[in-house]
């Protein structure tokens, strides 16, 4: 058979952040190429990344069509230069991926503190509403647009001169925290989806401190 030198893909892994979704697998090909197929549980298979020597395939365009669906992918192995060749069962070797539900599993990207403004003893902190690759009516939706109230943010803040952190939470992208007048504070934010069982939290945003460029002070 022409498939004696082909090996099935293995370690199929979904890598997804803010719905940017790539399927990765092994091994690096030697005298073989791969094609990926993806489908929903009830849908038809759609082929992507035809006869590639890569060991990854960007499936974002497919999963953003409905991020609440559950997807399955499979990776076919073909002999290089003889892609019509099939295995002993009459079809090429392939391996299935784990199931993947983007809405429940995509990693939350690192948030960014967009701005902060002090007015007296209050500081308004705004977290940037990251754009995703999910579309509706020809526009890209933000993380908030997609997750709605399932997404909260936690703000950790502390006096620059001490280490004791306080926290605030919000169902929007804004905080309004109490501070001492004339005292500098630092803070970072974290995105959280409390209802999830996996990938509940993002990594921490970069730390911002009052007195830096993003800040604004008003008496």
């Amino acid at each position: 058979s022409g498939t004696t030198n082909t090996v099935a893909a293995y370690n199929l892994t979904w890598k997804s952040t803010n719905f940017k979704t790539i399927l990765e697998w092994e091994p690096k090909p030697v005298n073989q190429v791969y094609t990926v197929q993806i489908s929903t549980k009830s849908g038809d298979w759609k082929s992507k990344c035809f006869y590639t020597t890569d060991t990854e395939c960007d499936l974002t365009d497919e999963i953003v069509k409905d991020v609440k669906q559950t997807y399955l992918a499979r990776v076919f192995s073909y002999p290089a230069g003889n892609v019509e060749s099939t295995g002993s069962a009459g079809e090429p070797l392939y391996e299935n991926s784990p199931e993947f539900t983007p809405y429940l599993e995509t990693n939350l990207g690192q948030p960014t503190i967009q701005s902060f403004e002090q007015v007296g003893t209050k500081v308004n902190v705004t977290v940037e509403d990251e754009r995703t690759l999910v579309r509706r009516n020809n526009t890209f939706l933000s993380l908030r647009d997609v997750f709605g109230k399932d997404l909260i943010y936690t703000l950790y803040y502390w006096k620059s001169s001490s280490s004791g952190k306080k926290t605030a939470k919000t169902n929007t992208n804004e905080f309004l925290i109490d501070v001492e007048k004339g005292v500098s504070y630092c803070f970072f934010a974290q995105a959280v989806i409390p209802s999830r069982t996996v990938n509940r939290k993002s990594t921490d945003s970069p730390v911002e401190c009052m007195g830096q460029e993003k800040g604004e002070f008003r008496e």
Epitope: V146, G148, K149, T167, A168, N171, F175, L176, S195
Partner: antibody
């Protein structure tokens, strides 16, 4: 000042689909609030049905999820409720409400602060 | 589902008296998501208290909310004639959002 008005048939036959629309006036449906449906069975308490954001993001009560669809039409400043396969147990006053952010404890949380007057829907043949 | 149990079911009091309404949750509720509503016959509910203790704009200061975890209380310090109504607690932190069964405050 934002006002909400429910509209739709007051009588629906069993097994059919109940369809209601809520028209938002005095404000934009796209202004960062959520929009909810709640019902109240005769002489009983309140039951949350579900909510929608202008982007189309939805949350539903799991007990009704298989029968409920909430949609939004930003061009008409309206959102709608569809409840399929209705029975007499779906007879109730149906309210639409705005879920707006209020400051509390360092952050902002959503509460239903503006309600429609409610519309009575009877399921009967 | 978080079950909110309100007690008493009915409270019979006279104008000028103090009303204490209880709301107990089947599991801990973040105070940020706890609200109280007032409903009069033939009307939609009206938001009174949010964040367990913060009065909505325009709500008289005779209404106050307190509590945390699983036990929350709405107090009306001195009942006015217009306060006789049904009061509901609600949690909006966990889907499905749920309401208590209501406490009817009626004129004695």
């Amino acid at each position: 000042q934002v006002q909400l008005q429910e509209s739709g048939p007051g009588l629906v036959k069993p097994s059919q689909t109940l369809s209601l629309t809520c028209t938002v006036s005095g404000g934009s449906i796209s202004s960062g609030q959520y929009w909810s449906w709640i019902r109240q069975h005769p002489g009983k308490g309140l039951e949350w049905i579900g909510e929608i954001y202008y982007s189309g993001s939805t949350r539903y009560n799991p007990s009704l999820k298989s029968r409920v669809t909430i949609s939004v039409d930003t061009s008409k400043n309206q959102f709608s409720l569809k409840l399929s396969s209705v029975t007499a147990a779906d007879t109730a006053v149906y309210y639409c409400a705005r879920d707006a952010p209020y400051y509390y404890g360092g952050g902002y949380y959503y509460y239903m602060d503006v309600w429609g007057k409610g519309t009575t829907v009877t399921v009967s043949s | 589902e978080i079950v909110l149990t309100q007690s008493p079911g009915t409270l019979s009091l006279s104008p000028g008296e103090r009303a204490t309404l209880s709301c107990r949750a089947s599991e801990s509720v973040d105070s940020s998501y706890l609200a109280w509503y007032q409903q009069k016959p033939g009307q939609a509910p009206r938001l009174l208290i949010y964040g367990a203790s913060t009065r909505q704009t325009g709500i008289p200061d005779r209404f106050s909310g307190s509590g945390s975890g699983t036990d929350f209380t709405l107090t009306i310090s001195r009942l006015e004639p217009e306060d006789f109504a049904v009061y509901y607690c609600q949690q909006a932190g966990v889907v499905p959002y749920t309401f208590g069964g209501g406490t009817k405050v009626e004129i004695k």
